[in-house]
């Protein structure tokens, strides 16, 4: 799986919440960022994430689709120079400072159940998705026999009207 261009085909800001409407929030603690899954109070502001979409070519010998086997990869950046990374050894999702070109661990294959309900599959570990475990984000293995609609790996994207990236 190779990214076909160094520039994203589109980017937009959105807030990220779980299928059960808990918010994904990011807090700077001891010079590193922590990721939380929590209920927000009624008027509390949701954290925004910059989603960058990249086209990725699936190797034609694997897909049988020739040049046509394309998928969408996404990177998620809640604040400048920091991106969500898959730590496949620890089965964890972490926020790391990175420079471009980003490492493969920062890319996730996008799946969606509808336009604003999505799942993120680790590029470096197919079949493993960002999910919610004990009020934290974690990497969760989804058997191919299971339906991807399993709620703990589904996230909602809600639009934001702010066009800056904090």
């Amino acid at each position: 799986m190779s990214i076909t261009g160094i520039s994203p085909i589109t980017e937009y800001l959105a807030s990220l919440s779980t299928y059960n409407d808990q918010s994904i929030t990011f807090a700077l603690e001891d010079e590193s960022y922590e990721i939380y899954v929590e209920d927000l109070k009624k008027d509390e502001k949701k954290d925004k994430v910059l989603l960058s979409y990249y086209e990725s070519q699936h190797p034609s010998n694997e897909s049988g689709d020739g040049v046509d086997g394309k998928m969408l990869m996404v990177t998620l950046s809640p604040t400048k120079d920091f991106w969500l990374h898959a730590n496949n050894k620890e089965h964890s999702v972490e926020l790391h400072k990175s420079e471009k070109p980003l490492p493969d661990q920062a890319f996730f294959v996008l799946h969606n159940m509808h336009s604003n309900s999505v799942s993120f599959e680790s590029k470096t570990d197919p079949g493993v998705f960002i999910g919610v475990k004990d009020n934290h984000l974690a990497l969760i293995k989804v058997d191919s026999s299971e339906n991807l609609s399993t709620e703990n790996i589904l996230f909602k994207l809600s639009e934001t009207h702010h066009h800056h990236h904090h």
Partner: antibody
Framework: EVQLVETGGGLVQPGRSLKLSCVAS????????MYWIRQAPGMGLEWVSS????????YYLDSVKGRFTISRNNAENTVYLQMNSLRSEDTATYYC??????????????WGQGTLVTVSS | DIQMTQSPSVLSASVGDRVTLSCKAS??????LDWYQQKVGEAPKLLIY???NLQTGIPSRFSGSGSGTDYTLTISSLQPEDVATYFC????????FGQGTKVEIK
């Protein structure tokens, strides 16, 4: 080469049923969302229904909900549209289309040539 | 539901002209917008996806732009083979087509 071939259209009386089929070839069918889009004579395009790659999620235009059912058979590379309780306003060319990317509901990258459904007594 | 409004309904221009088609969404659609071309008697064809990305095999005289609720398809130099109806389409929330703009040669 990607190909989508629709069949099953024809003349049908109001209230009756019809089942459209779309056979796909030239790509890994089970990786893509599939869609039905229709176009009444001389009119614009109207999205009708969507089904995700594993068939677990389906979506419908409000005016066809409860009457139309989209389904797919990934082993046979085929997507279906079962149309019940047909009305004169369902008269249209029905196109089958394939998503642009694996696993996502974004864009209709490939279209069939369409099959005409005429609902008339 | 998101409504998509295209203007003008019909556009008549000369060969070589720069042509601009407009599409307005009832809500912010986050650049989740395509443009399709449909010639008489043919199935529609994807021209532009995600607002400004040219589909493989489409001539570079076609380009797209926009954000939020306002989007544009531009044909930099109109050719006789561009005579068609052009539809915008959003997939940010559900799936909705605009009513189309018919492009004719003067």
């Amino acid at each position: 080469e990607v190909q989508l071939v629709e069949t099953g259209g024809g003349l049908v009386q109001p209230g009756r049923s019809l089942k459209l089929s779309c056979v796909a070839s030239g790509f890994t069918f089970s990786n893509y969302w599939m869609y039905w889009i229709r176009q009444a004579p001389g009119m614009g395009l109207e999205w009708v229904s969507s089904i995700n790659n594993d068939g677990g999620n389906t979506y419908y235009l409000d005016s066809v909900k409860g009457r139309f059912t989209i389904s797919r058979n990934n082993a046979e590379n085929t997507v279906y549209l079962q149309m019940n309780s047909l009305r004169s306003e369902d008269t249209a060319t029905y196109y089958c289309a394939r998503g642009h990317y694996y696993y996502t509901s974004y864009s209709f990258a490939y279209w069939g040539q369409g099959t005409l459904v005429t609902v008339s007594s | 539901d998101i409504q998509m409004t295209q203007s003008p309904s019909v556009l008549s221009a000369s060969v070589g002209d720069r042509v601009t088609l407009s599409c307005k969404a009832s809500h912010n659609i986050n650049k989740h917008l395509d443009w399709y071309q449909q010639k008489v008697g043919e199935a529609p064809k994807l021209l532009i996806y995600f607002t400004n990305n040219l589909q493989t095999g489409i001539p570079s005289r076609f380009s797209g732009s926009g954000s939020g609720t306002d989007y544009t398809l531009t044909i930099s130099s109109l050719q006789p083979e561009d005579v068609a109806t052009y539809f915008c389409f959003q997939y940010n929330s559900g799936w909705t087509f605009g009513q189309g703009t018919k492009v004719e040669i003067k």
